[in-house]
């Protein structure tokens, strides 16, 4: 490769000058050898235009020179009064044109804007505001002030001090004339449109004594911010449009193939069905800024997104916007997990939630997506144990299996539980994921009594029937509290073959509390799991009452009542908000469900796994 180096491309406009600097290794020979600038012709020959030995070609005469700077190993080719004819392929080099010590340079000269002398350039984003300053002399202070827009060879009046306003600028332009002594008037244009782009002329007075000032207004479309997110992950668009539109409806839209923008969500309650269950528009701050969170990213979510403000809740020309180009990386770090989990009425679901494995200490949350208005997601459970009171006894968040996944178990399912739920943490917000729970036809696999009344001081057995398909699973009973579900000590009774030859309709694992104490009152779960992966659960409420009759009480499935009356507790709603996502301590205060007492422990509680025949009852 050649040791000579320079710019591979140079772009400029007609009438301008360029200074092309070429670098060479500053050896003694190189410093003193001939330097040249030549143009490559169709034949491949390179015709010298200017050289360090004083040669200048005829079409470069008076407008080009080459200066060598041997001390730092550079030479500079200056070319003035560029024309479009100068566009082409050149070489800067050392020695003889045909030898290899050269570097290829492409020069592109385009038609430039011809701005009158003294033109002030204003560069403003679309939808924003510009203030054009127009100076004038004292003798023109009492005279008419005006702003014109130059269109071709004509000038169109935009606004003047006699209250004329061009219809194209109606309701978004004003001319301000300051008090005496200040020899400048200003024109303020709000909600700039791309069509406002162009050359303007300020004028004060008329005739030969008038004051004029040119202004070049460049209205830019916002450069889209590039956003790269992982498949199945989450993206947050933070939109700050300024105080001027703080009280105007906000929206996020996606640019389609027709270059129009389809509303994804807005503050007027509109939402694209493709984002159902996985989008939130977080309430705006006082400054009018807001954010939109989209979870469960799909490849088809890629595209150009705009946020903006307009009373119609959709894109309108001349209103401020912000832009993003979203790329969804299919080589995702976020593991696949079911996006739909199915359960039956009365049954349960166990949802696996991914989180960034580097953030094992982060707080974990689960919330219920609600689609009303802008969408919201009240928290139901968190790893520190706070649970919405109406979920008492039937919802738990477990740190297992760990290493990037936690588990949420919800049982006593009803059709009202169908919907979208979000898994999130107070750490990496890109790992928020969405799961849909669907309630389908069917019967729960685990059968427990509806509710149980135990007698103080006596023994209580609670049966849990499971089908043969769970024979290889680990069975457990646990006592639910608002900080989790504490597994009760298991007591192995009898040989394990009880579950091997599973030819009966059902098998049984039973919980024994002996003797029953006040602290035993509460919710108990029977469940199955494989290692750290949880399967179905069933819940039973145990009420404890004073002794009335002597003896032991065994609750058989035949005596199982309907599900216990649910406690209806007032609960403050906790929502995912902009700040709260980062710091869940910022959520609104709410009642905490009181812990349901000591965990049953020691020899008082035992789990007995045996066949139903041995328990003296069966469940069909």
């Amino acid at each position: 490769k050649s040791p000579v180096f320079g710019p591979q491309e140079v772009s400029s406009v007609e009438g301008n000058s360029v200074s092309i600097k070429c670098y060479y290794p500053p050896t003694s020979v190189n410093r003193h050898t001939r330097k040249y600038w030549c143009r490559k012709g169709a034949s491949g020959r390179c015709i010298t235009l200017v050289s360090s030995e004083g040669y200048v070609s005829s079409n470069y005469a008076g407008r080009a020179n080459l200066t060598n700077f041997p001390e730092n190993g550079t030479f500079v080719v200056n070319i003035a009064q560029l024309s479009r004819d100068d566009s082409g392929h050149y070489k800067c080099g050392l020695g003889i044109n045909s030898r290899g010590l050269s570097f290829d340079v492409s020069l592109e000269v385009s038609q430039g804007p011809e701005l009158p002398n003294g033109t002030e350039v204003y560069t403003v984003d679309v939808g924003r505001t510009v203030t054009i300053k127009c100076p004038f002399k004292t003798e023109n202070a009492p005279k008419t002030k005006a702003l014109y827009k130059k269109i071709g060879q004509t000038s169109v009046l935009v606004i003047d001090s006699r209250n004329y306003v061009n219809p194209n600028y109606k309701d978004r332009i004003r001319l301000r004339i300051p008090g005496t002594g200040q020899l400048i008037f200003t024109v303020v244009i709000d909600r700039l449109r791309l069509s406002d782009h162009g050359l303007y002329l300020c004028q004060a007075g008329d005739g030969s004594n008038r004051d004029e000032k040119n202004a070049d207004l460049q209205v830019l479309e916002p450069e889209p911010e590039l956003v790269y997110e992982d498949l199945r992950g989450s993206v947050t668009f933070h939109c700050a449009l300024g105080l001027e539109v703080a009280n105007v409806a906000k929206f996020l839209c996606r640019v389609n193939s027709r270059e129009t923008c389809d509303v994804v969500i807005n503050t007027l309650g509109k939402r694209d069905s493709a984002f159902e269950g996985r989008i939130l528009l977080n309430p705006q701050d006082k400054d009018g800024s807001f954010s939109v969170v989209i979870t469960g990213l799909r490849k088809e979510d890629e595209g150009r997104y705009l946020c903006g403000a307009h009373s119609d809740g959709q894109l309108q020309e001349g209103w401020p916007i912000q832009a993003w180009q979203l790329f969804v990386n299919e080589e995702s770090t976020i593991p696949r997990s079911p996006t739909v989990v199915k359960g039956v009425a009365g049954g349960s679901v166990a949802v696996l939630c991914p989180y960034n494995p580097k953030e094992s200490q982060s707080l974990k949350y689960w919330c219920l997506w609600e689609g009303a208005q802008n969408g919201r997601c009240p928290l139901l459970v968190e790893s520190q144990g706070l649970v919405q009171e109406q979920y008492e006894g039937r919802l738990s968040l477990l740190q297992e299996p760990g290493n990037g996944t936690f588990t949420v178990i919800l049982n006593q399912l009803t059709t009202q539980d169908a919907g979208f739920y979000w898994c999130l943490t107070n750490g990496d917000t890109r790992w928020r994921t969405t799961v849909e729970i669907k309630i389908i036809e069917g019967e729960p696999n685990l059968k427990v009594p509806g509710n149980v009344t135990a007698v103080l001081g006596e023994t209580l057995n609670i049966p849990c029937h499971f089908p043969c398909k769970f024979s290889s699973y680990e069975k457990y009973w646990c006592k639910w509290s608002n900080t989790g579900c504490q597994t009760l000590p298991s007591q192995d009774e009898g040989p394990s073959e009880a579950f091997v030859n599973c030819d009966e309709n059902s098998r049984l694992v039973s919980l024994t509390l002996n003797p029953v104490t006040r602290a035993d009152e509460g919710w108990y779960w029977c469940g199955v799991k494989q290692g750290h992966f949880y399967g179905e659960t069933a819940a039973v409420y145990v009420a404890v009452e004073e002794k009335k009759v002597a003896g032991s009480r065994y609750v058989s499935p035949a005596k199982a009542d309907a599900a216990p009356d649910e406690k209806v507790l007032d609960s403050g709603v906790r929502e995912i908000e902009n700040k709260a996502i980062q710091d869940p301590r910022l959520f609104a205060e709410e009642k905490v469900v009181a812990d349901t007492g000591d965990q049953a422990g020691g020899s008082r509680a035992s789990v007995d796994s045996s066949s139903s025949e041995e328990q003296g009852g069966s469940s069909k």
């Epitope: 180096f5 710019p7 591979q8 491309e9 140079v10 772009s11 400029s12 406009v13 301008n16 000058s17 360029v18 092309i20 670098y23 730092n72 550079t74 430039g112 804007p113």
Partner: nanobody
């Protein structure tokens, strides 16, 4: 104080494309020049591309030898953003990519010594 922030790195398959962004905060690029460099594990920082613009609509584009037309450096209309569009990526393009800006006039744009402000880098991984 100027802060440069790169973004757009990631994992891409050989033959794929990425667009890196370099955004300046604290002030606009009053130096009118920005360079991209890259550093592969165990190797020296290597010049990738450089853009220099004059206020009079003139722009100069410089590229490293290995680029061979695959990369394009450009400036955003916002004027405080510079992009590096990388096409036909190869596994040997795997590196941390840095953007840099000088305080004033620059000598040789290929030299890291010419630059005063550096970003924290963005990792580009090209798998075969």
């Amino acid at each position: 104080e100027v802060q440069l922030v790169e973004s757009g790195g990631g994992l891409v398959q050989a033959g794929g494309s990425l667009r890196l962004s370099c955004a300046a905060s604290g002030r606009t690029f009053s130096s009118d020049a920005v360079g991209w460099f890259r550093q592969a594990p165990g190797k020296e920082r290597e010049f990738v591309a450089h853009i220099h613009w004059s206020g009079d609509f003139t722009t100069y584009y410089y590229y490293g030898d290995f680029v061979k037309g695959r990369f394009t450096i450009s400036r955003g209309t916002a004027k405080n953003t510079v992009y590096l569009q990388m096409n036909s990526l190869k596994p040997e393009d795997t590196a941390v990519y840095y953007c840099a800006a000088p305080k004033g006039a620059i000598g040789d744009p290929r030299s890291t010594r010419e630059y005063d402000y550096w970003g924290q880098g963005t990792l580009v991984t090209v798998s075969s």
